[in-house]
């Protein structure tokens, strides 16, 4: 979390950011909230990035004001205008490019005065994995796929009944570049494995963490699986 | 054909004072943010002055900082670079770039006494 | 400033030879790279953006990877067009850098 305070000849106003993540290809959020204000025309909101010459999105006077906005970001912005009055000035981006990834200012006018706040974006690639037991292998072998990474991440296999064990030597990880040549299929197989025992496989970069469990009984096969995201601080 | 044609360059003194011009054709000018490069006799390429698409907005290096100012007129699409108290590490090829990607064809200072 | 280091700063190659020129940033730049070329006595064409995108009416034999702070340019069967000088530049962070260049030349 990064909050920071305006300094000029008007009073300073509080303006708070969160550090987030976004998924390349999907629509992602920079989080920005300051101390709101009774009349909506009194606000401005501008954000802008490191190393880029137009503005990320400008908000003045109730609407949108695009004449100064960067090619880079063309189409892919909006604020949630409805939510500007109350003090919320996060920015929706359209379709995450690995290249938005740096650090942005949120910047607000108004009438109580200035402040802005920089956030650090990173972008990337993350996906849930899903863990399957592999019928077409010869032994026991359960197949972890998760079909969208970048950074390449590591992947960790860990089981309930032997836990601390090193499954390195008992793994085979692979990564298959996807289509549009940025993002990576990770497929990571086990084997030996064992009946009556959850095995977890890990699959983590600078980005996210996720996990895929699964319980092999005699009787039936329970899944689970969860991502999270690594680094998110407010400033 | 998207086009950037620069002009002003010359001979100077050091200490004065110098305004480069560079004509765009083929896009809308007013749309794109726009950058000063220059090239030195070592071929080394130094980003000198950048702007954003309307104009309010610029960035400079410390090296040229308070002696170059960059500035645009949409309505005539042209890009301007004033430099002023001139050194003789400014000697160079200016070229006026749309992004990274778009470079004009460049016009060249000297700054010697 | 983020300095940008590239290399080799020059190579004698043969027609029709694959060659990589590369790029390390003093930090991570997020693909915020373009590659540009100059022949002699001209000025200069931009190749590559965002790290590995071609610009428009670039042949397919020029491509561009990496992230994080290392990147590289690889042009293959070269012709003799493509003997020429090879920058590298940041745009992730103010004031942007170029790598100090590439000179391909004929052997």
């Known amino acids: 979390l990064i909050i920071g305070f305006g300094i000029s000849g008007r009073h300073s106003i509080t303006v708070t950011t969160v550090a987030s993540a976004g998924n390349i290809g999907e629509d992602g959020i920079l989080s920005c909230t300051f101390e709101p204000d009774i009349k909506l025309s009194d606000i401005v909101i501008q954000w802008l990035k490191e190393g880029v010459l137009g503005l990320v999105h400008e908000f003045k006077e109730g609407k949108d004001e695009l004449s100064e906005q960067d090619e880079m970001f063309r189409g892919r912005t909006a604020v949630f205008a409805d939510q500007v009055i109350v003090g919320n000035a996060s920015l929706r981006l359209k379709n995450v490019q690995l290249t938005d990834a740096g650090t942005y200012k949120c910047y607000i006018i108004t009438s109580k005065g200035k402040g802005n706040a920089n956030l650090e974006y990173k972008t990337g690639a993350f996906s849930m994995p899903e863990v399957n037991v592999d019928y077409n292998a010869s032994s026991e072998t359960l197949r972890c796929e998760a079909p969208r990474w970048f950074p390449q991440p590591t992947v960790v296999w860990a089981s309930q009944v032997d836990q601390g064990a090193n499954f390195s030597e008992v793994s085979n990880t692979s990564f298959e570049l996807n289509s549009e040549n940025v993002t990576m299929k990770v497929v990571s197989v086990l084997y030996n494995v064992t009946i009556n025992n959850t095995y977890s496989c890990m699959i983590e970069n600078d980005i996210a963490k996720a996990t895929g469990d699964i319980k092999v009984t005699e009787s039936e096969i329970k899944r689970r699986s969860h991502l999270q995201l690594l680094n998110s601080k407010a400033s | 054909e998207v086009q950037l044609v620069e002009s002003g360059g010359g001979f100077v003194k050091p200490g004065g004072s110098l305004k480069l011009s560079c004509a765009a054709s083929?896009?809308?000018?007013?749309?794109?943010?726009m950058s000063w490069v220059r090239q030195t006799p070592d071929k080394r390429l130094e980003w000198v002055a950048g702007?954003?698409?309307?104009?309010?907005?610029?960035y400079y290096p410390d090296t040229v900082k308070g002696r170059f100012t960059i500035s645009r007129d949409n309505a005539r699409n042209t890009l301007y670079l004033q430099m002023s108290s001139l050194r003789s590490e400014d000697s160079a090829m200016y070229y006026c770039?749309?992004?990274?990607?778009?470079w004009g064809t460049g016009t060249t200072v000297t700054v010697s006494s | 400033d983020i300095l940008m280091t590239q290399s080799p700063s020059s190579m004698s190659v043969s027609l029709g030879d694959t060659v990589s020129i590369t790029c390390h940033a003093s930090?991570?730049?997020?693909?915020?790279i373009g590659w540009l070329q100059q022949k002699p006595g001209k000025s200069f064409k931009g190749l590559i953006y965002?790290?590995?995108t071609l610009e428009d009416g670039i042949p397919s034999r020029f491509s561009g990877s990496g992230s994080g702070a290392d990147y590289s340019l690889t042009i293959s069967s070269l012709e003799s067009e493509d003997f020429a000088d090879y920058y590298c530049?940041?745009?992730?962070?103010?004031?942007?850098?170029f790598g100090g260049g590439t000179k391909l030349e004929i052997k």
């Open positions: 930090q991570d730049i997020s693909s915020n």
């Open positions: 702007i954003s698409p309307g104009g309010s907005y610029t």
């Open positions: 530049v940041q745009s992730a962070q103010f004031p942007w850098t």
């Open positions: 083929g896009f809308t000018f007013s749309t794109f943010g």
């Open positions: 770039t749309r992004g990274r990607s778009v």
């Open positions: 965002h790290g590995t």
